[in-house]
């Protein structure tokens, strides 16, 4: 089981939208996949995917979760607030047929206040 997460760094304006993507791959098929998003080590949500569907569509405050076959798990934060800033990690585990787990690298989300004078010019960078 492999998990790749992106972007590494994401800067957005307060009130806008942030999208974090987790790519989950396994050479063989799986029947049920447990997924988890954490922010600064705290669990935001821990649904599972089976029959092509997520057991839960919400993930933390203003967070929406979606699954796009074959491998993309997306966490969309909308609207973004200042307290969304932090380090996000995606984790996945195949529960059926046999246990295998993996996690992505950290996505650091920076939320700028909705104030042009405080805007900093950071670049969103994705893994190569």
């Amino acid at each position: 089981l492999s998990v790749q997460q992106g972007p590494n760094l994401l800067q957005v304006r307060q009130g806008s939208q942030a999208t974090l993507v987790c790519q989950v791959d396994q050479a063989t098929a799986w029947e049920r996949l447990r997924v988890k998003w954490t922010k600064d080590g705290a669990i935001l949500c821990q649904p599972y995917i089976t029959n092509g569907s997520l057991s839960l569509g919400v993930c933390g405050p203003q967070g929406r979760l979606s699954w796009q076959a074959p491998s993309h798990l997306t966490l969309q934060l909308d609207p973004v607030s200042l307290n969304h800033s932090g380090a996000y990690v995606c984790w996945a585990a195949v529960e059926i047929p046999e246990l295998e787990e993996a996690e992505g690298n950290i996505t650091r989300l920076f939320v700028d206040p909705d104030d042009p004078t405080q805007n900093r010019n950071r670049i969103a960078s994705f893994p190569g």
């Epitope: 089981l1 492999s2 791959d25 396994q26 050479a27 063989t28 098929a29 799986w30 029947e31 996949l33 995917i49 089976t50 029959n51 092509g52 076959a69 074959p70 491998s71 047929p97 295998e100």
Partner: antibody, heavy 120, light 113 residues
Amino acid sequence: QVQLQESGPGLVKPSQTLSLTCTVSGFSITTGGYYWNWIRQFPGKKLEWMGYIYTSGRTSYNPSLKSRVTISRDTSKNQFSLKLSSVTAADTAVYYCADMADKGGWFAYWGQGTLVTVSS
Amino acid sequence: DIVMTQTPLSLPVTPGEPASISCRSSQSLFSSNTKRNYLDWYLQKPGQSPQLLIYHASYRASGVPDRFSGSGSGTDFTLKISRVEAEDVGVYYCQQHYETPLTFGQGTRLEIK
């Protein structure tokens, strides 16, 4: 360019242990998300997957080989190995090593194969 | 174990003519989670190791001529060669990676008439 090369004795006596090594070049076997496989081809051309060792060190074996098979690795040499115990003439085959990735699941690169004959 | 059954086992073809190989699995190789079929096709040319032709039932591997195509879903799959060339001679295998143990078809030997 990824290359896999099998090595080991071409002749093994019945009841002994068959030992083969696959040396990988152009790619690290510790790279995440990869399975390092052994596959054999019998004289009649039938292919049989024997097992793999994953990046994490986890192994999976073909139940048809029962407890006769062991796959291990030496990351310092970028090699992985096959041991098959209590061999009989029925284990005579061409033995291949091959890689497989989580992204895809197919056997992308194969060694050239090595013929192992079990005979006294 | 998933049993893979290929037909025919031998296939004599005239150059320039089409060829078709069937592969049937004892259980479905389609995943509703990933929307993929876990079925690949390989060609083993004389004296060589097998080489990937088609992955996930219908996707041509890099460098494979477009005269090769794969189709099917679930338990029934087909490999087609639109116009056979002399270099296509060898043994063709289907293989499932839906689950372990990974299993292959018996192979179909394509020969030139």
